[in-house]
């Protein structure tokens, strides 16, 4: 853009250098050149000479008019054609921007991920504004009436150390830019009700070699929360539909869940938990893939366990190699079963 330019005159914009997208805009150029009575004044947008809607107001001033200006940014400058000069002479330049006032932030959610030491608040920002937009997060104690404010761009992490004086808060978000301000709805937060247990991990799975083979899935969490309610969803990799099993979990020991599954099929498992009776779920765990054994009961497969996966990581595939002598093939399989895509709470889907 044109940040610092030595002007030999002035350039100004009506209604202003930042305006609402779709507005009609007039840009004025006034020369103050020494030893020049310009024959013509020219306007350039992003380096290209403009041909239309230019009016010469008087000897020193011209105007260009744009109907429904809809570009987020443009670099304008104007020049003079001075008699006896081969080149045009620069008069002045301006950066101009158009955008929208912000939408009211919606779907405000605040959670505390266990052990994080922060309350994380997120919201939907609405349609793009195209101009600098800030979000002011207000956190007001319902017990002490003290209010804190935090500046954010799309989410905020507030240290729980600064939320020591109270358990109940009112949280809301203001979206601010030079074209306007909008408030979210207020969210009532009780710190004890928004804790999400530490990530749940499926560590391994095995299929027994019984007459009716059963698959045992082992899963764990480092949570200190005593009463935890969990869901495990599972499906074959070829299926679109998930089956869901529910569990009350006690993570003082590794959880074992039993499934009677189709033989010789590749299954995907994911687990998520919440504190019993609360509303905030963990995101689904990374998908764990397990191959059930053939009906004959021959165990020509090797379960391969998941590494530790952080809550926000992308999908990690689990594969079972046909033979332990084919490591290269195994690696290729692991790279092609799943494309990693970001976890997004309840909406993460596989397959």
């Amino acid at each position: 853009g044109i940040t610092s330019i030595n002007c030999s005159g002035d350039m100004w914009v009506e209604p202003g250098e930042i305006f609402q997208m779709g507005m009609n805009v007039s840009i004025y150029c006034q020369e103050a050149l020494k030893h020049c009575r310009p024959r013509n004044l020219y306007f350039y947008k992003n380096g290209f000479k403009e041909e239309f809607d230019i009016t010469r107001i008087n000897r020193t001033t011209a105007r260009i008019w744009y109907k429904g200006f809809s570009e987020p940014h443009a670099y304008m400058h104007c020049t003079a054609e001075c008699p006896g000069h081969f080149q045009e002479t620069l008069i002045c330049g301006k950066d101009i921007s158009s955008g929208h006032p912000p939408d009211a932030p919606s779907n405000l959610t605040c959670v505390i991920y266990e052990y994080s030491g922060n309350m994380t608040c997120t919201w939907n920002t609405g349609k793009p504004t195209y101009i600098d937009t800030k979000y002011i997060v207000h956190v007001k104690s319902l017990e002490t009436e003290e209010e804190q404010q935090y500046l954010a761009s799309s989410y905020v992490k507030i240290s729980t150390d600064s939320l020591q004086g109270s358990r109940k808060y009112l949280v809301w978000v203001q979206a601010v830019n030079s074209l306007g301000m909008e408030n979210s709805q207020q969210l009532h937060v009780h710190l004890d009700d928004i804790v999400i247990p530490s990530a749940s991990i499926i560590s391994r799975a095995e299929t027994t070699n019984d007459t009716v083979p059963k698959t045992i899935v082992y899963w764990k969490s480092k949570t200190m929360i005593e009463k935890v309610f969990c869901e495990m969803r599972y499906k074959t990799t070829t299926n679109q539909t998930w089956s869901v099993k529910e569990f009350d979990a006690n993570f003082t020991y590794v959880q074992q869940s039993e499934f009677y599954l189709e033989p010789d099929s590749k299954y995907v498992f994911q687990v998520r938990c919440q504190e019993t009776g609360k509303r905030n779920w963990q995101p689904w765990s990374s998908p764990f893939v397990h191959q059930t054994s053939q009906e004959t009961g021959k165990r020509n497969w090797q379960p391969w366990s998941s590494p530790f996966v952080h809550q926000t990581s992308q999908t990690v595939s689990q594969v079972t190699a046909k033979s332990s002598h084919e490591p290269q093939k195994m690696e290729m399989l692991s790279a092609t079963i799943f494309r990693g895509h970001p976890a997004s709470g309840n909406h993460q889907d596989i397959g």
């Epitope: 101009i131 507030i158 600064s162 030079s178």
Partner: nanobody, 116 residues
Framework: QVQLQESGGGSVQAGGSLRLSCAAS????????MGWYRQAPGKERDLVSM???????FYADSVKGRFTFSQENAKNTVYLQMNSLKPEDTAMYYC??????????WGQGTQVTVSS
């Protein structure tokens, strides 16, 4: 840590003018998004004006066309020129330094009283 000190408040008749100043000290001032806020008795602390990162300025609807935010970088000082003051502009005025993800830091405030 930034310290902020407001001045320039006072009592004025409706239609009058005041110019508030806010002097900042501390080495993190350059990362501040500076704003002016006001709090009337029993009300929330509301944003009046804020300098945006793209060089533009936000003004609350209630002060548009009457208040002007300016800054003097060499002096680490921001100003709020308040013209055509109304009784409803009566409040404690604060300047604030906001940095992304951090708690907004306020000055002590300066009282503005507009009588009719």
């Amino acid at each position: 840590q930034v310290q902020l000190q407001e001045s320039g408040g006072g009592s004025v008749q409706a239609g009058g003018s005041l110019r508030l100043s806010c002097a900042a000290s501390g080495d993190t001032y350059s990362s501040c998004t500076m704003g002016w806020y006001r709090q009337a008795p029993g009300k929330e602390r509301d944003l009046v004006s804020m300098l945006m990162g793209d060089g533009s300025t936000f003004y609350a609807d209630s002060v548009k066309g009457r208040f002007t935010f300016s800054q003097e970088n060499a002096k680490n000082t921001v100003y709020l020129q308040m013209n055509s003051l109304k009784p409803e502009d009566t409040a404690m005025y604060y300047c604030g330094c906001a940095t992304l993800g951090s708690r907004t830091i306020w000055g002590q405030g300066t009282q503005v009283t507009v009588s009719s």
